[in-house]
């Protein structure tokens, strides 16, 4: 039970088109060392949404940057949501490796659904 766990407290989130969606994720430990990544979908075809270590993700803001929450919080906010953003999002912890980081543990996922923009 001391082993790191990845917690996504919302099983599902519904957001209106054009708004921002916050997807929450926390770790129970900083060990093992390694980055956090967010994906949409699972398996080989999953889409990288955010990589803590590298990359440019213009629509994604880490919540900790906004609120100075503690360093176990890896929640993200995705701006200007469209119906194409619907899907299940996974917060995934990687273990630092050489040459490549190795997936260590995934959260249970948060299903994002998109409502029509209120008239």
């Amino acid at each position: 039970e001391d082993e790191l766990q990845v917690i996504q407290p919302e099983k599902s989130v519904s957001v209106a088109a054009g708004e921002s969606a916050t997807l929450r994720c926390a770790m129970t430990s900083l060990i093992p060392v390694g980055p956090i990544m967010w994906f949409r979908g699972a398996g080989a075809g999953r889409e990288l949404i955010y990589n803590q270590k590298e990359g440019h993700f213009p629509r994604v803001t880490t919540v900790s940057e906004l609120t100075k929450r503690n360093n176990l919080d890896f929640s993200i906010s995705i701006s200007n949501i469209t119906p194409a953003d619907a899907g299940t999002y996974y917060c995934v912890k990687f273990r630092k490796g050489s040459p490549d980081d190795v997936e260590f543990k995934s959260g249970a996922g948060t299903e994002l659904s998109v409502r029509a923009k209120p008239s």
Epitope: E1, I7, P9, V13, V15, T22, T28, T67, N70, L72
Partner: antibody, heavy 120, light 106 residues
Framework: QVQLVQSGAEVKKPGASVKVSCKAS????????MHWVRQAPGQGLEWMGI????????SYAQKFQGRVTMTRDTSTSTVYMELSSLRSEDTAVYYC?????????????WGQGTLVTVSS | DIQMTQSPSSVSASVGDRVTITCRAS??????LAWYQQKPGKAPKLLIY???SLQSGVPSRFSGSGSGTDFTLTISSLQPEDFATYYC????????FGGGTKVEIK
């Protein structure tokens, strides 16, 4: 100081809808999630769902999916919970409750409760 | 959904007694657990969060422990104002409350 003030008691007929409000004050409204929890007479607490007042995103307990709608009005720092297709089993006290700060996903301040009675 | 089972459902005790309430989760929830106190006709009040952290303003006679699936709320020396119903709540996946434990006067 943090305050959550809810609307008054309601009596509704089966099949009708009810909309309960919760006005927040004493803190930055958009910085804290809000939950709704209900309690039937003599029973325990039942979590209904959550709303992020910042973007308006919502997450509902499976039991209430399709029947509950949570909304917010940032101009008045008010959240709303609407429950439709009411039945007698929905008779309960409905509470709004603010989620704590900083990844503390617990309920640190509660409204006074709103009694909703469903009776023909 | 994660189920939370509290025991006992009620306990009779006297002022000064040590009271222990347990809460079991249907799956591991790490330390993502809170305890609330509710008095008749009032809203619940947060006592303990993150399994063992005391909420500001709560007397130190209240303590929480546990991790994984088994958790405990202890009142070290019961006071007259402590007679109430206590609920556990998980925050690991959505939210779920336990069924409650009523602490009554013996």
């Amino acid at each position: 100081q943090v305050q959550l003030v809810q609307s008054g008691a309601e009596v509704k007929k089966p099949g009708a809808s009810v909309k309960v409000s919760c006005k927040a004050s004493g803190y930055t409204f958009t910085s804290y999630y809000m939950h709704w929890v209900r309690q039937a007479p003599g029973q325990g607490l039942e979590w209904m769902g959550i709303i992020n007042p910042s973007g308006g995103s919502t997450s509902y307990a499976q039991k209430f999916q399709g029947r509950v709608t949570m909304t917010r009005d940032t101009s008045t720092s008010t959240v709303y919970m609407e429950l439709s297709s009411l039945r007698s089993e929905d008779t309960a006290v409905y509470y709004c409750a603010r989620e704590g700060p900083e990844q503390l996903w617990y309920l640190d301040y509660w409204g006074q409760g709103t009694l909703v009675t469903v009776s023909s | 959904d994660i189920q939370m089972t509290q025991s006992p459902s009620s306990v009779s005790a006297s002022v000064g007694d040590r009271v222990t309430i347990t809460c079991r989760a249907s799956q591991g929830i790490s330390s993502w657990l809170a305890w609330y106190q509710q008095k008749p006709g009032k809203a619940p009040k947060l006592l303990i969060y993150a399994a063992s952290s005391l909420q500001s303003g709560v007397p130190s006679r209240f303590s929480g422990s546990g991790s994984g699936t088994d958790f405990t709320l202890t009142i070290s020396s019961l006071q007259p104002e402590d007679f109430a119903t206590y609920y556990c709540q998980q925050a690991f996946s959505h939210r779920t409350f336990g069924g409650g434990t009523k602490v009554e006067i013996k």
